[in-house]
């Protein structure tokens, strides 16, 4: 990462917002299958990608209002093995359903302290945060 | 998204950094298969998840030094259909290899202007940015 100039809150420019929420009026895409009323280990022939996959998964919400993004979604596999392409329901032990992980850049809001140690607004702290993105049908590892 | 209090750069607290790059000393995980010298439509029995998948993919780097994160990776499917679990090479036309997309929160750096219109450092602008995360083996949609 190249270094960006440091920057910290101030009451000096109240008309300016560092974080311009107004630039994205739409909420982040909520995964279509967040309602788990009919969650099962089968591959559908319609619906969103995660329900048509032969390694189907559901999404679980991860919310922290002091983090950007505030809402993240973690994938959770519905089957240990891959579902048969033919039937869409029977599992095939030759394939494993494995989580795909990603270290996502997030920012945590924390108190900023002035020279006298008093609370002076908000600062952001960059972190890497591990998120499971999807379940993938893979061939099992063959140990050499 | 809930609203965070506005905050903008100031020279008032030079010892504080709003964006603490130092908090993440390690670079983001580079996908292991970024070198494409032997990329082909087959599912390996070892290596990273994207090469063992029966919907294998490679990663393409998307770098923008005025964006956070500066490096993003886009998945690119290596096969139109899923690879057979049995052979790891022959394609099975009953399954499609489809890209999984995600609208990721990113931040663009732009000049901040003070009350008098002069350049006062950098502000961040939040945007949603479409990224392809992986390729998933799915059952084709059956049109009703």
């Amino acid at each position: 990462y190249s270094h960006w100039p440091s920057c910290c809150p101030s009451k000096g420019y109240p008309s300016e917002e560092l974080l311009r929420w107004s630039t994205v009026p739409v909420p982040p895409l909520k995964p279509a299958s967040l309602d788990f009323h009919s969650v099962s280990c089968r591959a559908s022939e319609d619906g969103p990608l995660n329900s048509r996959a032969i390694s189907p998964w559901r999404y679980e919400l991860d919310r922290d209002l002091n983090r950007l993004p505030q809402d993240l979604y973690h994938a959770r596999c519905l089957c240990p093995h891959c579902v048969s392409l033919q039937t869409g329901s029977h599992m095939d032990p030759r394939g494993n359903s494995e989580l795909l992980y990603h270290n996502q850049t997030v920012f945590y809001r924390r108190p900023c302290h002035g020279k006298k140690g008093n609370h002076k607004g908000y600062c952001l702290e960059r972190r890497l945060y591990r998120v499971s993105l999807a379940c993938v049908c893979v061939r099992p590892r063959v140990m050499g | 998204y809930s609203h965070w209090p506005s905050c903008c750069p100031s020279k008032g607290y030079p010892s504080e950094e709003l964006l603490r790059w130092s908090t993440v000393p390690v670079p983001p995980l580079k996908p292991a298969s970024l070198d494409f010298h032997s990329v082909s439509c087959r599912a390996s029995e070892d290596g990273p998840l994207n090469s063992r998948a029966i919907s294998p993919w490679r990663y393409e780097l998307d770098r923008d030094l005025n964006r956070l994160p500066q490096d993003l990776y886009h998945a690119r499917c290596l096969c139109p259909h899923c690879v057979s679990l049995q052979t790891g090479s022959h394609m099975d036309p009953r399954g499609n290899s489809e890209l999984l997309y995600h609208n990721q929160t990113v931040f663009y750096r732009r000049p901040c202007h003070g009350k008098k219109g002069n350049h006062k450092g950098y502000c961040l602008e939040r945007r949603l940015y479409r990224v392809s995360l992986a390729c998933v083996c799915v059952r084709p949609r059956v049109m009703g």
């Epitope: 919400l61 209002l65 002091n66 993240l72 973690h74 108190p111 | 998204y1 809930s2």
Partner: antibody, heavy 121, light 108 residues
Framework: QVTLKESGPGILQPSQTLSLTCSFS??????????VSWIRQPSGKGLEWLAH???????FYNPSLKSRVTISKDTSRNQVFLRITSVDTADIATYYC?????????????WGQGTLVTVSS | ENVLIQSPAIMSASLGEKVTMSCRAS?????MYWYQQKSDAPPKLWIY???NLAPGVPGRFSGSGSGNSYSLTISSMEGEDAATYYC???????????FGGGTKLEIK
């Protein structure tokens, strides 16, 4: 000024369903970022978080009680509800509703006075 | 699930004495919150984000710590400080608010 007040049956029998209401004023659950939790405390013991509901109806539950607990809200009436099915003596406690403060980075800033729930046959 | 262990469970201090109580987490947490509770009353938020005093909390209180280990300190014990103090942490996934078992502070 923010106030929260819990109300409930006081006493109920084992295997019955406990229904609690949290009536609040001084804030709105339609405000982005706002959320209310239910927390309980058996007499002389510690605090146990039960469930949380946000302005956008996102709901979260303590995994140890998830199968028995339901949280809901009526935004227009400034009320949050809690249901616990199949109660037994382990559910005897003072039940609090609490508002998650935003300026205080997620601590529970405002609490109700609590309502005592007893389970007895 | 992260478990918070507070120690000591009960302690007594003389007026004017320095008091320190601890809260240890079974796995690392970002921030800790502390609450004060007196008998027959709901808890009150006392310290947020590890070291920030809630409005109205006397300056003799302080909070510190990181990772697995956090503490609440009273620089000079006063009579009104006798109460039970709970630490609390939050994890966003799986979503959970966890409280410690409490430290009961009495006047010696």
């Amino acid at each position: 000024q923010v106030t929260l007040k819990e109300s409930g049956p006081g006493i109920l029998q084992p295997s019955q369903t406990l229904s609690l209401t949290c009536s609040f004023s001084g804030f709105s659950l339609s405000t982005s970022g706002m959320g209310v939790s239910w927390i309980r405390q058996p007499s002389g013991k510690g605090l146990e978080w039960l469930a949380h509901i946000y302005w956008d109806d996102a709901k979260f539950y303590n995994p140890s009680l998830k199968s028995r607990v339901t949280i809901s809200k009526d935004t227009s009436r400034n009320q949050v509800f809690l249901r616990i099915t199949s109660v037994d003596t382990a559910d005897i406690a003072t039940y609090y509703c609490a508002r998650r403060g935003y300026d205080n980075y997620g601590g529970f800033v405002d609490w109700g006075q609590g309502t005592l729930v007893t389970v007895s046959s | 699930e992260n478990v918070l262990i507070q120690s000591p469970a009960i302690m007594s201090a003389s007026l004017g004495e320095k008091v320190t109580m601890s809260c240890r987490a079974s796995s690392s947490v970002n921030y800790m919150y502390w609450y004060q509770q007196k008998s027959d009353a709901p808890p009150k938020l006392w310290i947020y984000y590890t070291s920030n005093l809630a409005p109205g909390v006397p300056g003799r209180f302080s909070g510190s710590g990181s990772g697995n280990s956090y503490s609440l300190t009273i620089s000079s014990m006063e009579g009104e400080d006798a109460a039970t103090y709970y630490c609390q942490q939050f994890t966003s996934y799986p979503y959970m608010y966890t409280f410690g078992g409490g430290t009961k502070l009495e006047i010696k």
